[in-house]
């Protein structure tokens, strides 16, 4: 393919005389001839077939090799059959010799034959007879030879005639190169083929404008000795904001984006976002819409949710249960959670302050996924405001006013605190006498104490209770030689306090005498 060849010499392209050096001058002569298409061209011919021992040299002008290493010489020639020339058998030949001589510069008009290196003896595949001439059969022979690798700046070609009747119709000298191409968005420059027939020249490509090398896969190709690019390795890909169009990367249009070089095509901006310039790698959010740090560029811009709906409450002394419905607008996100803001407000001016850290929230104060919460350990007879805010992944990015549902309540009387200092006063076979101290914070008048007890190995599956108004009690009707667990709590009008820590007591083993003590006032079956 001609496109792979870089011409250094083409005798057919020259319209004027070639003026090569002929030695002796009576040997090769420059004439006007015809090529295979009968187009007039400058040719050299020799037909010194009468005398033996012919040694006619024809030398080209100096040929600069450029950056070539392997040179190709294509000869087109016509050779006359010796049989068509009467009386020349023995002196007529049907071959000629091809030589070259490397130099760094033009050495002048002298042909120093001994410096020339023989490339080959050239013979015709077909010569023509006089009859062929009459039928105008131009039997043109084409022979290609290689020379190289060459080390100097240029060279001469020489043709030695040894007694043939021959016309050099065309001398073409060229080297092969792989012409610059764009493959996989990488530009591979013009590359001269290697010095050996089998050599491959590895060439690294340069990414086209607005493209980048694929990770750890830089573009490479191999230029073969025949001037052909072999299978590409690696590739370039269009950068963020650009997409491939043929051998180039074009910017994404307005309202389109491409966030990563790994994406193939530009995409239309997601909902509630825009790009007002070409080559965008991401789309900006419209006013009031946001993108969370964890949101990929391809998701729509979103906004904070509206306030929760239908907030209701239930007060049990100093515990408040809150419940609500989801917001009407989740802002376009499905990561809605809730947070509770508790404020304690004064009776006078209605000024409110945050509740502080001694308040309990079940299951938690923030990041609530369910739409209910229980707020505990509030002060009795106090005013509180609870704000319930719906929150999503972009709420913290918004500078607009918070949207929440609020409720104001007043707590009732608080239940007493935990009973402390439980002691076993007396332990018998079937009864145990206990005493304890009043709660540190009765939060009102203690109306009674409730004692819960059960056999330890029953693990509270079945328990009994006993109520008493004093800070001591005797629990009867127990089994001898059995370990019992006891817990006590105080009761006021506001409700039950928390049970005291467990106390383990073992009754005495069975004996002959029986003691009659106070019997348990109540015994209830209460499975855990």
């Amino acid at each position: 393919q001609a496109a792979k060849e870089v011409l250094l010499l083409d005798s057919k392209a020259q319209q004027t005389e070639l003026e090569w050096i002929s030695s002796p001058p009576s040997g090769w002569e420059e004439i006007s001839g015809l090529d295979e298409n009968y187009t007039p061209i400058r040719t050299y011919q020799v037909c010194q077939v009468m005398e033996p021992n012919q040694n006619n040299w024809l030398r080209t002008n100096w040929i600069s090799k450029g950056n070539a290493q392997r040179i190709f010489v294509e000869l087109k020639f016509t050779l006359r059959d010796c049989n068509s020339l009467p009386g020349v058998l023995g002196t007529c030949k049907e071959t000629f010799n091809l030589y070259y001589y490397e130099t760094d510069y033009d050495t002048g008009r002298n042909i120093r034959e001994n410096l020339y290196v023989k490339i080959d003896t050239i013979a015709a595949d077909e010569s023509f007879t006089q009859g062929d001439l009459g039928e105008r059969k131009m039997k043109l022979n084409t022979e290609v030879r290689e020379i190289g690798p060459l080390s100097k700046k240029g060279f001469y070609l020489a043709f030695q005639d040894v007694g043939a009747c021959i016309a050099l119709v065309s001398v073409k000298v060229y080297y092969k190169k792989c012409w610059s191409i764009v493959e996989n968005l990488a530009v591979f420059p013009d590359t001269v083929t290697g010095s050996e027939f089998s050599s491959l020249v590895e060439v690294r490509g340069t990414c086209v404008s607005s493209a980048e090398e694929e990770a750890e896969n830089s573009p490479r190709m191999h230029c073969s000795a025949e001037g052909e690019w072999l299978v590409p390795i690696g590739k370039c890909i269009c950068k963020a904001g650009y997409q491939q169009k043929g051998d180039t990367c074009e910017p994404c249009g307005r309202r389109f984006y491409k966030s990563s070089s790994q994406d193939l095509q530009c995409s239309r901006c997601p909902t509630h976002s825009f790009s007002d310039r070409e080559g965008s790698s991401r789309c900006e959010c419209e006013d009031g819409y946001y993108r969370a740090p964890s949101d990929p560029p391809y998701v729509a811009c979103t906004r904070p949710p509206s306030a929760p709906q239908n907030l209701i409450f239930n007060i049990n002394q100093t515990t408040v249960s809150l419940e609500w419905s989801p917001p009407a607008d989740n802002g376009g996100r499905n990561d809605v959670t809730y947070r509770i803001l508790c404020k304690r407000c004064s009776w006078e001016q209605g000024e409110c302050v945050p509740c502080g850290s001694n308040i309990g929230y079940m299951p938690q104060q923030t990041g609530l996924e369910d739409n209910y919460v229980t707020v505990m350990d509030l002060l009795a007879h106090a005013n509180y405001t609870f704000e319930v805010e719906a929150v999503n992944g972009v709420s913290d990015l918004s500078r607009s006013q918070r949207l929440f549902a609020a409720v104001s309540i007043t707590t009732g009387q608080a239940a007493p605190s935990q009973v402390s200092g439980v002691m076993k006063e007396r332990v018998l076979q079937r009864s145990v006498q206990l005493s304890w101290q009043e709660p540190e914070h009765p939060n009102g008048v203690i109306t009674e104490y409730e004692i819960k007890y059960y056999e330890k190995d029953q693990r509270e599956r079945t328990y009994s209770t006993l109520k008493t108004k004093s800070t001591s009690a005797s629990i009867n009707n127990l089994k001898p030689g059995t370990v019992y667990v006891f817990q006590i709590r105080a009761v006021t009008a506001a409700g039950y306090g928390n049970y005291s820590p467990r106390l383990d007591v073992a009754t005495l083993e069975e004996a002959s005498g029986k003691m009659f003590e106070a019997t348990a006032v109540s015994s209830e079956q209460n499975p855990v």
Partner: antibody
Framework: QVQLLQSGAEVKKPGASVKVPCKAS????????MSWVRQAPGQGLEWMGW????????TYAQGFTGRFVFSLDTSVSTAYLQISSLKAEDTAVYYC??????????????WGQGTLVTVSS | EIVLTQSPATLSVSPGERATLSCRAS??????PAWYQQKPGQAPRLLIY???TRATGIPDRFSASGSGTDFTLTISRVEPEDFAVYYC????????FGQGTKVEIK
């Protein structure tokens, strides 16, 4: 300069012989074949044949075999045409001409001035 | 043997005019015949040989063309010194001449 010099006119009786010389100068005699051409009075040209000046090998055209002989003396760069048993119809101007061989065709590029041979009783 | 027939036998032209001489072969011959010019009392002179190559010193008003069996010698503008007899000659194992065309002043 390249030239071929032939001898002057010859008058011969029928049955006699004549030897026409052609002396070459200005080039290497043995590098080119020599052709002989006959032109009868008022007639066209007739090619008689040629001789390889290197080997002495002659080629004769039809009608010019037997009585016609081409020969050489390379030492003096001279070609000869000898005609024996002359006949009246042999009366003509005889030209020697240097042969121009090329790949694409041949011709005679240098001619002698011609020698008129008259055969008359 | 190949016979070459030239026509016309005589061609009358004025100086400056174009002259076209024909040479027809009895069978297909060499790519182009050689052409000679002969003036009275002179030896023939080679004009054209090979593939329409002009011999040394021949002006470019002389050109030859043709193929197969029909060949032409053209004198683009006839000069006074061009009035002569012109012969075509085919080459090969045996050479033959045409009978000639005389170009004379009109």
């Amino acid at each position: 300069q390249v030239q071929l010099l032939q001898s002057g006119a010859e008058v011969k009786k029928p049955g006699a012989s004549v030897k026409v010389p052609c002396k070459a100068s200005g080039y290497t005699f043995t590098s080119r074949a020599m052709s002989w051409v006959r032109q009868a009075p008022g007639q066209g040209l007739e090619w008689m044949g040629w001789i390889n000046t290197n080997t002495g090998n002659p080629t004769y055209a039809q009608g010019f075999t037997g009585r016609f002989v081409f020969s050489l003396d390379t030492s003096v760069s001279t070609a000869y045409l000898q005609i024996s048993s002359l006949k009246a119809e042999d009366t003509a101007v005889y030209y020697c001409a240097r042969v121009r061989l090329t790949v694409y065709g041949d011709g005679m590029d240098v001619w002698g001035q011609g020698t008129l041979v008259t055969v008359s009783s | 043997e190949i016979v070459l027939t030239q026509s016309p036998a005589t061609l009358s032209v004025s100086p400056g005019e174009r002259a076209t001489l024909s040479c027809r072969a009895s069978q297909s011959v060499s790519s182009n015949p050689a052409w000679y010019q002969q003036k009275p009392g002179q030896a023939p002179r080679l004009l054209i040989y090979g593939l329409s190559t002009r011999a040394t010193g021949i002006p470019d008003r002389f050109s030859a063309s043709g193929s197969g069996t029909d060949f032409t010698l053209t004198i683009s503008r006839v000069e006074p010194e061009d009035f002569a007899v012109y012969y075509c000659q085919q080459y090969g194992p045996s050479w033959t001449f045409g009978q000639g065309t005389k170009v004379e002043i009109k």
